[in-house]
Interface confidence: low
């Protein structure tokens, strides 16, 4: 059962996995929530009453009937591990901790203009999990203005104590906010020579590069495969660090794969989500139960199902036997990894599916593409909205693409003549335009957030933000599409499609059913050329065949570019203006999302 | 077809920063593939300087990798080399080459540009 | 580092010779080592890849054998336009190094 409410002066008693430092309760039951075992925690804060070397601890438990006796103690706060709830869990932690030093190796130190400087510093390098920034305010003059970079091996403070005129706070890489690049990258027949941080069992590379990312140390890995020539070493994961970041040495060896931590880019790839099955293969760990289950699907969901269940094997029934229901076998370590790997026994293999919800929404996978045509089928393009304007009549006004559970991205120009978010309704899930009655379900629109430096769609900044009055509840037909990363900057797109219910040509009529077309983007540079009278901004990314032909048009405003990239949808842009439709040399010109990301989420995260 | 070029001044003073830029054409940097610097003192044999992903990872040779910094411009669809405080011993022709595969790391240099020669003196 | 040490530093050879280049690695590199053909004035032009691997568009006159340290580089049918400097790279560790190159000529 999910339970998110903190328990003030309560202890758990006994069931202690490991303890670490955190400034708060909150955080505290967020680090429960990512470690592997912790289903509940006890936080000491600062009090009096209290000796002062306990607080700011968290001791991380676990046990066996998810819960522990409570004991009454002041400055304790207990609770649970999110790992309980359905919600979505993220790491990210924007707060800042006044008159709190949060301990670890100071591995660089500079000056800077504010906390908010520092802690964008530390976002930007790859080491830094936490800083510590002397305000100026503070007693010792030399030390005045001075940003201390940290590290630690768990990626938590090793020591919080009080000081005075100092604040602290974590990097925001889990909040999608680094300018660090995001190197997909796996390197075969390669092994990255450095040192080892630790080392894990996986059953693939992609499983071993997950477990890198959101291991607070590991900036690359190494994979040695089940090919791999010394037995002993086969499945093993290493996770790596160097001073400089990057692999100083690599050595060509086959059957073995490299490649680095993907922490910058997690916010936009499955991380946590392990969802693979594993043919012919053991996992091996302390066993948590053996049920009956009817496929490797079924046992998967049992172990899913189960909190404390990490991983499982499955052995399939012998011909007729136990009514044709085989073994499912729930497992879990100390880690989450199974301790050893084994092939050839006929066992299915694979993870829980209850830390996907520790990945955004947007990464999971949406029922395949339908080639060909032009009218979309039901489902296809989840995150696409109609937005209508009830006055003076109900009509679609614009298109828009979901987010968030509870946020809308769109085009600014949409709202020209919009007096009052009142008269908005936005509908998702739709297909057919014909679909929507009186009694049509929708969202209603609390309020809207155009970019203040937005004058006209030609001169860029065509992008704003809907905020709905009430969440949306994700299905497979209203979910929310990835922003691209800051750190995928460089990634040429090659699978992109514009879709709305717009006019097919100039003078036309909004359509009734969803349209899609596929189109190429376009650089900006031949861009340019082709809206001599216009600037194209790098704010702004164009799309479109030469010869013409297939384009978005009046209505499809606000809607999405969605691209494909590994196995991803990304909203790379918002369709935004073009000379005519469909012109010849005459692009479609968007929004370019990436160029945003800062300013949505700072507007979509604000407390 | 994959073509490199490389720019910059022909004469430095020593003690100063070399800076060359290798103007890719017929292939977007930002596809793959390492990108590198070798250099070739007159009359010597060849050296490789570094390389570079494009999505910004670096290798260096560890006898230069203090001066040596090679940078990506996937929007100009070029790389740069700097080498600072260099010396009448920094006079070669230099050369930037991509790799041949894709998928691994720095191999085959199967593209190379003409060459540059840059000479150090006062 | 791992040196490439090629042999011999030049030869003299008449055309329709058979000619060898040597090139010893100083620790073992498998068979992670590439032949280049560098002309007077020219860059570098990759012909043997993989130690064995002939590139392609390269004459089949040109081919390399080896493994571990001891690596052999062969023109069965020495040619007028083969007139050039032959480097060995081995690439199985970092940093990348050439052997110092043979130069070749016609007798």
């Known amino acids: 059962e999910c339970v998110t409410q903190l328990l003030k002066d309560t202890c758990f008693e006994g069931g202690d996995i490991t303890t670490v430092f955190t400034p708060s309760a909150k955080y505290c039951q967020v680090v429960c929530t990512y470690h592997p075992r912790c289903l509940l925690f006890t936080f000491t804060a600062e009090s009096p009453s209290e000796d002062p070397t306990r607080w700011f601890t968290c001791v991380l438990k676990d046990s066996v009937t998810e819960t522990l006796p409570r004991v009454n103690r002041t400055a304790a706060i207990s609770g649970y591990s999110f790992k309980q709830c359905s919600h979505q869990i993220s790491a990210c932690n924007k707060d800042i901790y006044v008159d709190l030093d949060m301990k670890g190796i100071n591995y660089n130190s500079s000056v800077a203009k504010s906390a908010q400087e520092c802690q964008e510093r530390c976002t930007d390098d790859v080491h830094c999990h936490f800083f510590t920034y002397a305000t100026r305010q503070f007693p010792s003059l030399e030390h005045r203005n001075i940003c201390l970079l940290k590290h630690t091996q768990t990626g938590t403070p090793t020591r919080i104590t009080k000081l005075d005129k100092v604040v602290s706070g974590f990097s925001l890489k889990s909040c999608a906010l680094s300018n660090l690049a995001c190197i997909r990258d796996i390197f075969p027949n390669t092994v990255f020579a450095d040192s080892n941080i630790d080392s894990v069992m996986a059953p693939d590379a992609f499983v071993c590069g997950r477990i890198c990312t959101h291991h607070p140390g590991c900036l690359f890995f190494t994979f040695f495969s089940q090919e791999w020539p010394k037995e002993s070493q086969r499945n093993l994961c290493l996770l790596k660090t160097s001073e400089s970041g990057l692999p100083s040495t690599r050595i060509k060896k086959s059957k073995a794969l490299s490649g680095f931590s993907l922490q910058s880019c997690r916010h936009s790839i499955p991380v946590f989500c392990h969802s693979s099955f594993y043919h012919d293969t053991d996992f091996l760990g302390e066993e948590l139960d053996i049920v009956a289950a009817k496929s490797h699907e079924a046992c998967q969901k049992l172990c899913t199902n189960a909190v404390r269940c990490q991983f499982f094997t499955y052995t399939p029934a012998q011909a007729s036997c136990n009514e044709g229901k085989g073994k499912c076998y729930l497992k879990l370590s100390s880690n989450g990894s199974p301790t050893k790997i084994l092939h050839g026994r006929g066992g299915i293999s694979g993870y829980t599916l209850r830390l996907c919800k520790m990945d955004n929404e947007c990464t999971t996978k949406i029922k395949p593409r339908i080639v060909g045509g032009t009218a979309s089928v039901r489902g296809e393009w989840p995150w696409q909205v109609t937005l209508h304007t009830t006055s003076p009549t109900q009509r679609h006004l614009c298109g828009g693409s979901i987010i968030g559970n509870q946020w809308i991205l769109t085009a600014a120009h949409c709202f020209y003549g919009v007096e009052s978010p009142k008269i908005l309704r936005v509908y998702s899930g739709i297909l057919n335009q014909s679909e929507i009655k009186e009694d049509t379900s929708f969202f209603g629109v609390q309020e809207i957030i155009i970019h203040d430096q937005y004058k006209m769609a030609e001169s860029g900044y065509d992008i704003a933000l809907l905020k709905l009055e009430t969440t949306v509840n994700y299905t497979d037909s209203q979910r929310p599409i990835c922003l691209p990363s800051k750190g995928d900057r460089n990634v040429i797109y090659t699978d992109c499609w514009v879709t709305g219910w717009g006019y097919r040509k100039l003078r036309d009529k909004i359509q009734n059913t969803l349209q899609k077309a596929k189109i190429p983007l376009v650089t900006n540079e031949e861009c340019q050329k082709r809206y001599r009278g216009h600037k194209i901004t790098h704010k702004m990314i164009c799309a479109g065949y030469r010869e013409g032909g297939k384009d978005a048009c009046k209505g499809d405003s606000g809607g999405p570019l969605s691209c494909k990239h590994n196995e991803v949808w990304h909203l790379v842009g918002i369709t935004s203006w073009g000379e005519g439709c469909a012109q010849r040399e005459r692009p479609g010109v968007y929004t370019n999302v990436v160029e945003y990301v800062d300013w949505i989420l700072e507007k979509t995260q604000a407390v | 077809q994959v073509q490199l070029q490389e720019s910059g001044p022909g004469l430095v003073k020593p003690s100063e920063t070399l800076s060359l830029t290798c103007a890719v054409s017929?292939?977007?940097?930002?596809?793959?593939?390492?990108w590198g610097w070798i250099r070739q003192p007159p009359g010597k044999g060849l050296e490789w300087i570094g390389s570079?992903?494009?999505?910004?990872?670096?290798y260096y040779n560890p006898s230069l990798k203090s001066r040596v910094t090679i940078s990506v411009d996937t929007s100009k669809n070029q790389f740069s080399l700097k080498l600072s405080s260099v010396t009448a011993a920094d006079t070669a022709v230099y050369y930037c080459a991509r790799d041949r595969t894709t998928v691994s790391l720095i191999e085959y240099f199967q593209h190379w540009g003409q060459g540059t020669l840059v000479t150090v003196s006062s | 580092d791992i040196q490439m040490t090629q042999s011999p530093s030049s030869l003299s050879a008449s055309v329709g010779d058979r000619v060898t280049i040597t090139c010893q690695a100083s620790?073992?590199?498998?068979?992670?080592l590439n032949w280049y053909q560098q002309k007077p004035g020219k860059a570098p032009k990759l012909l043997i890849y993989?130690?064995?691997n002939l590139e392609t568009g390269v004459p089949s006159r040109f081919s390399g054998s080896g493994s571990g340290t001891d690596f052999t580089f062969t023109i069965s049918s020495l040619q007028p336009e083969d007139i050039a400097t032959y480097y060995c790279q081995q690439f199985h560790l970092l940093p990348i190094t050439f052997g110092g190159g043979t130069k070749v000529e016609i007798k």
């Open positions: 570079i992903l494009h999505s910004g990872v670096t």
């Open positions: 620790q073992d590199i498998s068979n992670y």
């Open positions: 017929g292939y977007s940097i930002s596809s793959g593939y390492f």
């Open positions: 993989d130690a064995s």
